[in-house]
């Protein structure tokens, strides 16, 4: 609460996160023209990336384009991309939606459709829907440990959210354990009124707000964090503004002296840890 | 404008960026002693990296050192690095400018020059100028979509820069479309009074400032962002303080059971999105 | 100092860091059943990662699990993980400490011990201590150049920590050169009252605070940074809360058409650059 006689100072914060959990993923795998069910295990090194402290990412879904090579090929026949003659294809043109640079030729994509030929990583990425349900939907049961060190330099005061008395096998709960800093991802979503299973398909951004309202006067000292959660991406966003949260990255390799890559379109939850608050002292 | 009767609160912000664009790169490629012109396509997975929300990087230039192996070799004969006898080479010495640890021997680098032998990734990186013009100079035409969610917790008010009424095919313009949040990289530079083609060679840091000056009183409510742009790195910086913006990263692989790497010195623009402002309410 | 007649404004900051240094690492390497001493050189591309401006990471130690494949194998016999019959193993169970999903079978781990079989990246990671002394303990002699651009938009004032008069071969010293922005990592630790050699084993988080107390009135203008250092992770942290600083990442490759990975558990120092302060003007 506001104490007008106090000198207020904003918090200086550092965050460290640690995600735990394993996901079993079942998907169709095609090898040598034969499609069969494949099972694989994803651990932290597979589904998360070494990001900075105040943000961490958990991959919940993906689409792979394997064995791409830099060459010429027909572009993917998305809406409005088909052609019937070379006139429709403009040499040197880069359609922002396309994945390559047009050569000016209209070529067969398959039996029935023709598209403009492009110089690109081929075959170009198919614009297919993210798998539903999400491949790593079990990430709902992953946990994240959040360590937060705060400082009020003007008051020469430092503290952290984890106290020596805390129990490392706790799980945060708004009522039963509001000071525990180990959070189940599914619980974070529930607290924010969101459905993890749904968001996991396209990805999203979730805010974990840590509010420090610190009274640093010795006679009524109080300085503990309050956690709250809210979704940061717009779930009602128009298609043209790229709903959800995804990014593409590539694994490069050489095969028979040919430079190739596997392109991964990774959908997932980016968790932003937003630390704010003030320290007040007479 | 300052309303002294209002309670002011700083903004809590989360940012999400999405870069679009393809670059065609033409460079000399040497294979089996033969040098020829090579053309390649770079898409987002090739020129950008999954970074946090408030920063994104676009590679505009690079220098590659291919097929490096951990072994002994003569160091690169940069200014002041040549030797004429072993006396000039100190076993175990690591010159901060060098790329390895000296063995104490002075060995031939080429027909005319001798340098200290080092234990390093060999052959050591040549200290050659960044290509001019920049290899991905066409990145000037890439676009970035910036999504910004803001929150004034004390006023329990949340909003975002993208409104449902907005058009996903717009491009930001200071006069004609100042609320559009899709920015052409070249336009950002032009607004900041900088030359993209020039900065692309050595790299640089560009600030995109988003200023929220929010009046949250119901009778005169206003809360929309104002965008401005300024260069953050020092273009007049002395050579010793590393002008521009670059970093090195490596791609590791095995060839005939020998651990090798390709070292990439990536030059580019780091865009920092700096969100600030206040929300005021009676 | 507080000048009550001034209008104060918080700093808007952008940071760029550049680490320099080479480490020679000596470790036991096992090949074809024979263990011998291996020497290798680590440069910036090997021990650091392209992170954002306000944070950088230097790897000081590591544990490798090479040639992992997705298959079935006995889990690592850590404390409490051994079994004597299948009853102790629960099909589909994922122990948060384990690295896989139990099949329900109790199988031999070695001559004397049995553990639950798991579907995982195999062989599973051994829970061995981080090497002591740290493999890259010589990182103590690495240096980091910190470039900091600051802005007070309300006062339309911009400056940076590096002035044209500065010497690029300086090293920060609290007394002799407090404005030099090139820092030896070991010195940072010494200033913070910490032992680099010790922290390098398990990793840690170190704060570099840059304080700008700017008087922007023309008659008594002053705006230069003050650097201070403090450890941000809790060195007395309970084992259950993951002391130190480490993360796992993987290098994926194919061998004889089998997808494999090398898992690296990287320990190191994350340096957080915390910029704060105000600009005051009448």
């Amino acid at each position: 609460s506001d104490k007008l006689y106090q000198r207020k100072e904003p918090v200086i914060s550092s965050v460290h996160t640690k995600v735990k959990g394993i996901a079993e993923v079942t998907e169709n795998v095609t090898e040598g023209g034969v499609t069969k069910l494949g099972h694989s295990i994803f651990d932290t090194a597979d589904y998360t990336f070494p990001l900075q402290g105040n943000s961490f990412f958990v991959m919940t879904n993906y689409v792979k384009s394997e064995g791409q090579v830099q060459t010429l090929c027909p572009e993917y026949p998305r809406r409005g991309a088909q052609c019937s003659s070379d006139r429709r294809c403009k040499k040197g043109w880069m359609d922002p939606q396309s994945k390559g640079i047009q050569t000016g030729r209209c070529v067969p994509y398959d039996k029935t459709r023709k598209t403009c030929e492009v110089s690109a990583w081929c075959p170009t990425e198919e614009e297919k829907e993210a798998p539903r349900p999400a491949l790593l939907r079990s990430a709902e049961n992953f946990t994240v440990l959040i360590k937060n060190n705060i400082h009020f330099p003007g008051h020469n005061y430092t503290t952290r959210n984890i106290l020596p008395t805390m129990n490392g096998s706790c799980t945060f709960h708004k009522t039963w354990d509001p000071q525990c800093s180990i959070f189940r991802l599914g619980d974070i979503f529930q607290e924010a009124g969101e459905n993890f299973t749904e968001v996991a398909v396209q990805g999203g951004i979730m805010g974990i707000e840590i509010y420090w309202d610190c009274n640093l006067d010795s006679w009524s000292h109080h300085c503990r964090p309050r956690y709250s959660f809210r979704r940061l991406d717009d779930k009602n966003m128009d298609e043209s503004f790229v709903p959800g949260y995804n990014f593409r990255y590539a694994k490069y390799y050489k095969e028979n002296n040919v430079e190739k890559r596997t392109l991964i379109k990774a959908f997932g939850i980016r968790f932003d840890i937003l630390v704010f608050g003030t320290g007040g002292k007479f | 404008s300052d309303k002294l009767y209002q309670r002011k609160e700083p903004v809590i912000s989360s940012v999400h960026t999405k870069v679009k664009g393809i670059a065609e790169v033409t460079e000399n490629v040497t294979e089996g002693g033969v040098t020829k012109l090579g053309h390649s396509i770079f898409d987002t997975a090739d020129y950008t990296f999954p970074l946090q929300g408030n920063s994104f990087f676009v590679m505009t230039n690079y220098v590659k050192s291919e097929g490096q192996v951990q072994t002994l070799c003569p160091e690169y004969p940069r200014r002041g690095a040549q030797c004429s006898s072993d006396r000039r080479c100190k076993k175990g010495w690591m010159d901060p400018q060098s790329k390895g640890i000296q063995t104490g021997r002075c060995v031939p680098y080429d027909k005319t020059r001798k340098t200290c032998e080092v234990s390093a990734w060999c052959p050591t990186e040549e200290e050659k100028e960044a290509p001019r013009p920049a290899l991905l100079r066409s990145a000037e035409n890439f676009t970035v979509l910036i999504k910004n969610n803001i929150h004034f917790p004390g006023h329990n008010y949340t909003t975002r820069n993208i409104l449902p009424t907005m058009n996903g095919s717009c491009t930001f313009h200071k006069t004609w479309d100042p609320q559009c949040s899709i920015f052409r990289l070249g336009d950002i530079f032009q607004e900041a009074g900088e030359n993209f083609t020039e900065v692309a060679v050595q790299g640089g840091i560009m600030g995109i400032e988003i200023y929220w000056d929010c009046n949250l009183d119901s009778w005169s409510h206003h809360c929309r962002p104002r965008y401005s742009f300024r260069r953050l790195d020092d273009k007049n910086m002395d050579e010793s303080f590393v002008p521009g913006y670059n970093f090195r990263y490596a791609k590791y692989y095995k060839e005939n059971n020998v651990e090798k790497r390709t070292l990439i010195k990536a030059f580019g623009i780091r865009f920092d999105i700096l969100v600030f402002g206040t929300g005021g309410k009676f | 100092s507080d000048k009550l007649y001034q209008r104060k404004e918080p700093v808007i900051s952008s940071v760029h860091t550049k680490v320099k240094g080479i480490a020679e690492v000596t470790e036991n390497v096992t090949e074809g059943g024979v263990t011998k001493l291996g020497h290798s050189i680590f440069d910036t591309a090997d021990y650091t990662f392209p992170l954002q401006g306000n944070s950088f990471f230097v790897m000081t130690n590591y544990v490798k699990s090479e040639g992992q494949v997705q298959t079935l194998c006995p889990e690592y016999p850590r404390r409490g993980a051994q079994c004597s019959s299948d009853r102790r193993c629960k099909k589909g169970w994922m122990d948060p400490q384990s690295k896989g999903i139990q099949t329900g079978r109790c199988v031999p781990y070695d001559k004397t011990r049995k553990t639950c079989e798991v579907s995982a990246w195999c062989p599973t990671e051994e829970e061995k201590e981080a090497p002591r002394p740290a493999l890259l303990r010589s990182a103590e002699n690495f240096t980091v150049l910190i470039k900091n651009n600051i802005h007070f938009p309300g006062h339309n004032y911009t400056t940076r920590n590096i002035l044209p008069t500065m010497n690029g071969s300086c090293t920060f010293h609290k007394t002799w050169d407090p404005q030099c922005s090139i820092f030896r990592l070991g010195d940072i630790f010494q200033e913070a009252g910490e032992n680099f050699t010790e922290v390098a084993v398990q990793g840690g988080i170190m704060g570099i605070e840059i304080y700008w107390d700017c008087n922007l009135d023309s008659w008594s203008h002053h705006c230069r940074p003050r650097y201070s250092f403090r450890r941000l992770d809790d060195k007395n942290m309970d084992e259950s809360f993951v002391p130190g600083y480490n993360f796992r990442y993987a290098k994926y490759y194919k061998e004889n058409n089998v997808e494999k990975r090398t898992l690296i558990k990287a320990f190191g120092i994350r340096f957080d650059i915390l910029v704060f302060g105000t600009g005051g003007k009448f």
Epitope: G33, G67, V69, T71, L72, P74, P108, K111 | - | -
Partner: nanobody, 115 residues
Framework: EVQLVESGGGLVQAGGSLRLSCAAS?????MGWFRQAPGKEREFVAG????????RYADSVKGRFTISRDNAKSTVSLQMSGLKPEDTAIYYC???????????WGQGTQVTVSS
């Protein structure tokens, strides 16, 4: 699924020539040839994009083999000259989405080069 029928295989002396042909049941962006020698894996030989652009050859056949195609007829042929005993294999016609990527294969035709 695309149907592919190869023809033109046979026995030939080292240094001789042979022409393989392949007809596809429908038009396709790229057509190419692979081969498999006894006890070895199937390997790429030559490929051609639409209208013969681009073409790609394995290093071992460069300068000796020439691929050509007729889009109108959905056919591809492989002119092989300067044949060597190590060219002995079953040759397969294939179609795909680029000169590096093939999805459909023919039944194959035997080529034997005697020394």
């Amino acid at each position: 699924e695309v149907q592919l029928v190869e023809s033109g295989g046979g026995l030939v002396q080292a240094g001789g020539s042979l022409r393989l042909s392949c007809a596809a049941s429908e038009r396709t962006y790229s057509m190419g040839w692979f081969r498999q020698a006894p006890g070895k894996e199937r390997e790429f030989v030559a490929g051609s994009g639409w209208d013969g652009i681009p073409t790609r050859y394995a290093d071992s056949v460069k300068g000796r083999f020439t691929i050509s195609r007729d889009n109108a007829k959905s056919t591809v042929s492989l002119q092989m000259s300067g044949l060597k005993p190590e060219d002995t294999a079953i040759y397969y016609c294939a179609t795909g989405t680029s000169v590096y990527h093939y999805q459909y294969w023919g039944q194959g035709t035997q080529v034997t080069v005697s020394s």
